[in-house]
């Protein structure tokens, strides 16, 4: 099933227009922004969500340190080029004829230059680091719980299996997510990691991409587990290239 | 060939207890989830737990109340489910079954069960 | 918490016949559904996940169908082989669950 079929709406991607045009009739749904068809029973790729929501109207200590080679999306957001299969093109570029390479979740990871500038491939983000604060509780959280409850929501929610959740850490208020999946794991039908974390992160903010479907309501034996602050990390399988000029 | 064998079940009385086992072979239990399902003589199938044992998550439906506990020794590929507090209304066959590695909960494989009897 | 129904709880089908068996969840569960044929005395075996994806070794004769909430498996050309009991299951999530399992639906072949 691409969408479902009885209202023809697209439950992963509210960011879509549906039609009952496909084959025989089925609902088919294609992004805003691209025109691109998109499966309705997984996540949508992140370069056609991006594009989407640039097409929208505007008013829509066991704690891991980041290695050195850990890239923060500071850029915001832009405009992305995407690649038939919805993936980003590994050089984007802007109006202004100003190019730059990023890794397989559109982070930048290269100085911006011109046109000139090349990017040989696309370089796979095989690991994700996200870093939450969650508001006072009573008490801290059981660590397991915890752990057991997030990989859970990663399983059902965004449908990414508990084997590329890495580990969970904890100290409070502190919660790291690890995220793990290298080219050679990721198997045909599999959800991309940087997919899930992209939709995490805007349910997070209580910009929900599910269509009809509730906010995240997240909780720990019965306690809500509300964030208040997110920062996420991508590591690529080929460190970034930086001059030193951005380093200093 | 992939295989689920429980057993520890027999008699018991009334506010006793019991540890089964689900010993799993021709796969690497890491990969999978499973869980234990019970059915009482002549009625349906419950659920009432399920174990991730690659990351030791565990997860009980919701009437059970902390009487019972699944855990895993991943080493020796064993399941465990420990019963405590026993009554006549848990009298039942109690299967394990493994998911089959995909992100939905279906169960491709079972074991043949072993009787658990509450009686005095 | 999703709740699974079955029905019917018991129906009876000529050799050759066809069944159908319902099973409706409470929620949307997409298309996160399995179907189980047990027989006496032995374990349940999968025959259909994903709604309609037939199991491995599974005959051709049995189909699964539905989305969101209401889900049909239909037994075609029925052998008496096919007299067992057929459970439903929702397979989406684990969390404040209190049965994910149908009540059943025996099958009766004369």
């Known amino acids: 099933h691409t969408a479902a079929q009885d209202n023809c709406t697209c439950p992963t991607n509210k960011m879509t227009v549906c039609s009952p045009d496909g084959p025989g009739g089925r609902c088919q749904c294609r992004a805003l922004g691209s025109g691109m068809a998109v499966d309705c029973s997984t996540l949508t790729s992140k370069c056609l969500l991006l594009k989407a929501r640039m097409s929208a109207p505007k008013n829509a200590r066991t704690l891991v340190r980041p290695s050195e080679h850990a890239l923060v999306d500071n850029d915001g957001l832009y405009d992305p080029d995407c690649d038939p299969e919805g993936r980003f093109k590994a050089r984007q570029c802007n109006q202004t004829s100003v190019c730059w390479c990023v890794n397989s979740v559109g982070v930048r990871r290269t100085d911006k230059g011109d046109l000139s500038l090349r990017c040989d491939e696309l370089v796979r983000t095989h690991h994700i680091l996200i870093d939450l604060r969650h508001r006072p509780t009573a008490g801290a959280f059981n660590h397991s719980d915890l752990d057991a409850e997030l990989r859970r929501l990663f399983r059902e929610r965004y449908r990414l299996h508990p084997k590329f959740v890495a580990a969970v850490h904890y100290e409070q208020p502190t919660i790291q997510i690890e995220l793990r999946q290298n080219t050679s794991q990721k198997a045909a039908g599999d959800v991309d990691i940087g997919d899930a974390a992209y939709y995490f992160e805007r349910d997070i903010k209580g910009e929900s991409l599910f269509q009809g479907r509730g906010g995240l309501d997240l909780r720990v034996r019965g306690e809500p587990l509300q964030v208040e602050r997110t920062l996420i990390y991508y590591l690529d399988e080929i460190p970034p290239k930086f001059s030193m000029k951005r380093l200093t | 060939q992939e295989q689920l064998k429980e057993s520890g079940g027999g008699l018991v009385q009334p506010g006793g207890s019991l540890k089964l086992s689900c010993k799993a072979s021709?796969?690497?239990?890491?990969?999978?989830?499973v869980s234990w399902v019970r059915q009482a003589p002549g009625k349906g199938l419950e659920w009432i737990a399920y174990i991730y044992p690659a990351f030791h998550n565990t997860y009980y439906a919701t009437w059970v109340n902390g009487r019972f506990t699944i855990s895993s020794h991943n080493a020796q590929n064993t399941l465990y489910l420990q019963l405590n507090s026993l009554t006549a209304a848990d009298t039942a066959t109690y299967f394990c079954?493994?998911?089959?590695?995909?992100?939905?909960?279906?169960?491709?494989?079972w074991g043949p069960g072993t009787l658990v009897t509450v009686s005095s | 918490d999703v709740v699974m129904t079955q029905t019917p709880a018991s129906v009876e089908v000529a050799v050759g016949g066809t069944v159908t068996i319902k099973c409706q969840a409470s929620?949307?569960?997409?298309?996160?559904l399995a179907w189980y044929q047990q027989k006496p005395g032995q374990p349940p075996k999968q025959l259909i996940y994903?709604?309609?994806t037939l199991a491995s070794g599974v005959s051709s004769r049995f189909s699964g169908s539905g989305y969101g909430a209401e889900f049909t498996l239909t037994i075609s050309g029925v052998e008496c082989a096919d007299a067992a009991t057929y459970y439903c299951q929702q397979a989406l999530t684990i969390g404040n669950v209190d049965n994910p399992f149908g009540g059943g639906s025996e099958v009766v072949v004369k």
């Open positions: 079954a493994r998911d089959a590695g995909s992100v939905d909960y279906n169960f491709n494989l």
């Open positions: 021709g796969f690497d239990f890491n990969n999978y989830g």
């Open positions: 929620k949307n569960i997409d298309s996160n």
């Open positions: 994903a709604a309609s």
